[in-house]
């Protein structure tokens, strides 16, 4: 079998939901010593970066200015050390937002409910779309989808304090082109007294964990790595 390097990690810096005409930044984290990184879009080569010096950098950033629906879709990356290529990274879905109109989000029976009550969100957008998306701020990876001509409903079932937080919805023209976000609706759930004080407050958009953790190797890191390698050999 053909030998390959471990697959890199692909991430969107700040958020994978990029307003149209704004810049998206994707990070590909591979390996120290990689001489070339390639970003692929829908299976075709999109961009190339050659880090300098390669032995000091474990990844690169790919900049996608002027975001639009032609650049929205599935991205992946690979890297090369010498003549050896890595496996392909997982796919990352990059979405363009602020297309067309703004939906309206409402909640029934209201924004203040008691734990155990059934709650339904309604997202309405009068322009032609059939798919609607509901996102909880700080949890934008957990997208709920629903379908309808001009309105979609999102039944939440009996809620707990874990459902507390701010919600927004989008109309979707395809999987990767979304409307402007609705105004946020803050859901307040009372009850579960013992859990209330422990319920964490969600970070607001963008998700705080969507960051590029690329590092430059310093001389000290290199010395420590060499020392560790020597120590391992001595132990053997």
């Amino acid at each position: 079998p053909k030998q390959t390097l471990p697959k890199p990690i692909i991430r969107a810096e700040s958020t994978y939901m990029v307003p149209k005409e704004k810049q998206a930044t994707l990070c590909c984290q591979g390996s120290y010593g990689a001489v070339e990184y390639q970003l692929h879009f829908e299976g075709s080569l999109f961009a190339v970066e050659r880090p300098k010096p390669p032995e000091r950098i474990n990844g690169v950033k790919f900049h996608i200015p002027d975001m639009n629906s032609r650049k929205a879709g599935r991205y992946s990356c690979i890297y090369r050390v010498g003549e050896l290529w890595s496996e392909r990274s997982d796919l990352l879905d990059l979405v363009v937002t602020e297309m067309y109109d703004t939906p309206t989000l409402s909640v029934h029976p209201g924004p203040e409910v008691t734990s155990g009550e059934k709650v339904t969100f309604y997202c309405r957008l009068d322009t032609a779309t059939s798919m609607f998306l509901l996102l909880k701020e700080g949890r934008s990876r957990d997208v709920q989808r629903s379908y309808g001509k001009v309105q979609a409903e999102f039944p939440m079932g009996p809620v707990t304090t874990a459902h507390r937080g701010s919600y927004r919805c989008f109309g979707s023209y395809n999987n990767y082109a979304w409307s402007f976000p609705s105004e946020p609706v803050k859901l307040l759930v009372t009850g579960d007294i013992e859990n209330t004080s422990l319920a964490p407050t969600d970070p607001t958009f963008p998700d705080s964990w969507d960051t590029c953790l690329l590092t430059r190797e310093t001389g000290l890191q290199k010395d420590l790595a060499l020392w560790d390698h020597t120590a391992q050999n001595l132990l053997r």
């Epitope: 075709s44 080569l45 999109f46 050659r50 300098k52 650049k71």
Partner: nanobody, 127 residues
Amino acid sequence: EVQLVESGGGEVQPGGSLRLSCAASGRTFASAAMGWFRQAPGKEREFVAAISRSVGDTYYADSVKGRFTISRDNAKNTVYLQMSSLRAEDTAVYYCAAVVPTYGNNIYVHSAAYNYWGQGTLVTVKP
């Protein structure tokens, strides 16, 4: 707003050479990654060569590797495509394109990445 104007096209015999130029207006040239694409009659537009913003890293389509050279002169706001050992299959309209603004040394290969395009210059290779 960036405007790109190509020049240098013309008719040449197989094995001959041509140098295309692309002059960019505006002060954003230094922050632009640049590329050349071509479109032959009845075919889709295809990538030819690209160059990064600052250090001048380059990338070429396999079909032109070793024959074409892309370069840039930031002082003159111009990108060049030196074409040698030309073949009949190189006949096409050649387009200059820019990605503005960009950072780092990304080299862009996909046409969707480019947000500014020139009008094109025709290159004809025939005996």
